[in-house]
């Protein structure tokens, strides 16, 4: 039975030029996570692996950092990364957990975090 | 250039165990991630497991209860051992580079791959 | 694990014609997909990653393209050092997994 839930930095904001961290964490379960994939519709932005370090995909390779963690750091953010990105958890032996963070990137500096929330 | 050379005995009994090794030249084995991939007649490529840098190993779980990937740094090599195999063993056995990093899971440099045949 | 599944399974093209192979992955891998050329009594080589970047030294004639679960190997005038099995392979999550492969021949 999968017991865990993701935890993830929810809806947020940031400012068109500027960067922002996308974080998930896995909770509430003793499975071992063995990759980590970070997504964009069906883009593949990167993935950790938990033997194997990060890959991260040549598209993005310009605009994105590994970490902090198991996070994803994107980088000279225009309006057109404005969009749902999400953390596919792979594990054993419980399976594939999905977190979900939406991101508005802002023309003005009024960016402001969201709260966190919970994806079971 | 990566050099990857296997070598082992071609033909192997039933209930036994399969050794190979792959000699590696032109690179340390102590950076990316050294694999073990096969091809039996008339079937596809199935990738049997890894060896990291770092000394962690991850099996395909259809091989998981019979096969160890083991490494000799200082002769900068690595070893497969299969145990209990049948007819349905008998491939061509390749080992291979992968680097996690730029690639992904690609395998960019491959042994020249040696035939193992299965029989009493 | 993911099946990867190829087709056609052989393709007999003329010398300056395009070919195009399709791999269809049995669940959704993003642009985790890799493709190999095995010539005759040679082991693969790796030919595209992340779908549609080309590897060193791959000529331009080859193309790769798709997302999500259709992928395209294109080779847009083939030679006749093109002749061998290509393969598809995902690593969106592991076991890696390879397709069955497509024989490409010359007419």
């Known amino acids: 039975m999968m017991t865990g839930t993701i935890e993830t930095t929810g809806n947020i904001s940031a400012e068109k030029g500027g960067s922002i961290i996308l974080q998930c964490h896995l909770s509430s379960t003793t499975a071992q996570v063995t990759q980590v994939n970070w997504e964009q519709q069906d883009q593949l932005l990167a993935i950790c692996n938990a033997d194997l370090g990060w890959h991260i995909s040549p598209s993005f390779k310009d605009r994105v950092a590994p970490g902090p963690g198991l996070g994803l750091t994107l980088q000279s953010l225009t309006v057109n990364d404005t969009g749902e990105y999400f953390c596919i958890y792979h594990t054993y032996p419980d399976g594939t957990y999905t977190g979900r963070i939406f991101l508005e990137v802002l023309e003005s500096s009024v960016a402001e975090h969201g709260a966190r929330f919970q994806i079971p | 250039e990566v050099q990857l050379q296997e070598s082992g005995p071609g033909l192997v009994k039933p209930s036994e165990t399969l050794s190979l090794t792959c000699a590696v030249s032109?690179?340390?084995?102590?950076?990316?991630?050294w694999n073990w991939i096969r091809q039996p007649p008339g079937k596809k490529l199935e990738w049997m497991g890894y060896?990291?840098?770092?000394?962690?190993?991850y099996y395909n779980p259809s091989l998981k209860s019979r096969i160890t990937i083991s490494r000799d740094t200082s002769k900068n090599q690595f070893s497969l051992k299969l145990s209990s195999v049948t007819a349905a063993d008998t491939a061509v056995y390749y080992c291979?580079?992968?680097?996690?990093?730029?690639?992904?899971?690609?395998?960019?440099?491959w042994g020249q791959g040696t035939t193992v045949t299965v029989s009493s | 694990d993911i099946v990867m599944t190829q087709t056609p399974l052989s393709l007999s093209v003329t010398p300056g014609q395009p070919a195009s192979i399709s791999c269809k992955a049995s669940q959704n891998v993003r642009t985790a997909v890799a493709w190999y050329q095995q010539k005759p009594g040679q082991s693969p080589q790796l030919m595209i990653y992340?779908?549609?970047y080309r590897y060193t030294g791959v000529p331009d004639r080859f193309s790769g393209s798709g997302s999500g679960t259709d992928f395209t190997l294109k080779i847009s005038r083939v030679e006749a050092e093109d002749v061998g099995v290509y393969y598809c392979?995902?690593?969106?999550?592991?076991?890696?997994?390879f397709g069955g492969g497509t024989k490409v021949e010359i007419k």
């Open positions: 392979q995902q690593y969106y999550t592991t076991p890696w997994t």
């Open positions: 291979a580079r992968l680097d996690f990093s730029n690639y992904g899971g690609a395998v960019d440099y």
């Open positions: 992340s779908a549609s």
């Open positions: 032109g690179y340390s084995i102590t950076s990316d991630s």
């Open positions: 060896i990291s840098y770092s000394g962690n190993t």
